[in-house]
Amino acid sequence: SLLPVPYTEAASLSTGSTVTIKGRPLACFLNEPYLQVDFHTEMKEESDIVFHFQVCFGRRVVMNSREYGAWKQQVESKNMPFQDGQEFELSISVLPDKYQVMVNGQSSYTFDHRIKPEAVKMVQVWRDISLTKFNVSYLKR
Amino acid sequence: SLLPVPYTEAASLSTGSTVTIKGRPLACFLNEPYLQVDFHTEMKEESDIVFHFQVCFGRRVVMNSREYGAWKQQVESKNMPFQDGQEFELSISVLPDKYQVMVNGQSSYTFDHRIKPEAVKMVQVWRDISLTKFNVSYLKR
């Protein structure tokens, strides 16, 4: 069954945590649907963003952080492992120095920590997708 | 009650027709939600677009056409009559020479016809909005 979009969930992250998302674009790639995943510092959507991951399907991925309300230096990738019309599985793993983003089991993007992952309090998944799975796994201590 | 988004409806347009849309952005303007309205030449979403109207709430509006699969010259406006967090009523009227876009009763944008409005067969409303009303009114002959 489908999860509501935008989908918001409280989360605590640290090295070893993984956020897993399963979904499908709502439109063909010609129409440039988007997927966005934001790791927020508060439960409020206006809060700062530790890791902003935005896919413009078929075109590009941009990653950034929003600090004290201001967007910082954008990182862009043309790597496009997503398939037109196909379900995707996205996993974002917290490594000691960066986030590693896997798409369908394939390492596709990395983003160096600018803000500690421990500052994350909420994850939001939204834009032009249907969402079937959202999970945060925590490293067993 | 809410209409599904993306929302797709068959439509025939000509001078005097008006498309009316009521909805609300799904996120605060700081997070740049989008609204998109596309007038297609076929019932298929991959078809050409006679009039493409995209709002990046709080930032800008872009208008364009997609002809033989290729985007043409984009028209951009910084006019932003939409209110953060507020419901909007959008009406797109077909004038003899252009589309006139009204936001909350106020004339806000125009777009000269590049393709005859009679070529329109489908209207799609989508991206980051909840949709409460969609109506196409036809001029009484």
């Epitope: 910082k72 230096q73 990182v75 000691p96 160096d112 920590h113 600018r114 803000i115 500690k116 | -």
Partner: antibody, heavy 123, light 107 residues
Amino acid sequence: EVQLVESGGGLVQPGGSLRLSCAASGFTFSSYAMSWVRQAPGKGLEWVSAINSGGGWTSYVDSVKGRFTISRDNAKNTLYLQMDSLKPEDTAVYYCTKYSGPELNTQYGMDYWGKGTLVTVSS
Amino acid sequence: NFMLTQPSAVSVSLGQTARITCQGGNFGSYYASWYQQKPGQAPVLVIYRDSGRPSGIPERFSGSSSGDTATLTISGAQAEDEADYYCQSGSSSDNTVFGGGTHLTVL
């Protein structure tokens, strides 16, 4: 071996200008963010400005905004600091520093420093 | 204005443990780095990302952070550790600030 060699310091009158240079060697200059840090005589360190690896993103401490401009020439492996409208309080040793990544990102610190060049602003 | 506050001086007996604090930072969000500066020399990075140690830095140097305080610990201080120490952290990821510095004396 990583080397950062600053030049261009000297004595200048208040309101005057100087251009500092930092010649980099021993690493792929175009892959790393760089910055300028200064130290007034007998005082502590003060970060002044930084620039990302490609040169498209810059940042400044408030006290120099609008007066100093950081830039880089990746073909020449050189970092610059254009200092205009100089004030006596700009008097300091200016160090060129290398970040250990392409971004202005505080997580890694500044892993290499030059020996510094002295700027004196006095009438 | 964002400021990092360090004690101006800390003393430690040879072979004992020295702790230098850095207060006022948002260390829940931003990482701390520490630098050692000896007279007439350029600073040297001794700790990055709160607790990381660059190659060539002795194991007796360690770092930690919690809340608004970062701490540099020198376990078994040596005579050659006598120097000025500066903390550094972000007021955002692309803006950085240094603490006022701490002079460590090894007795």
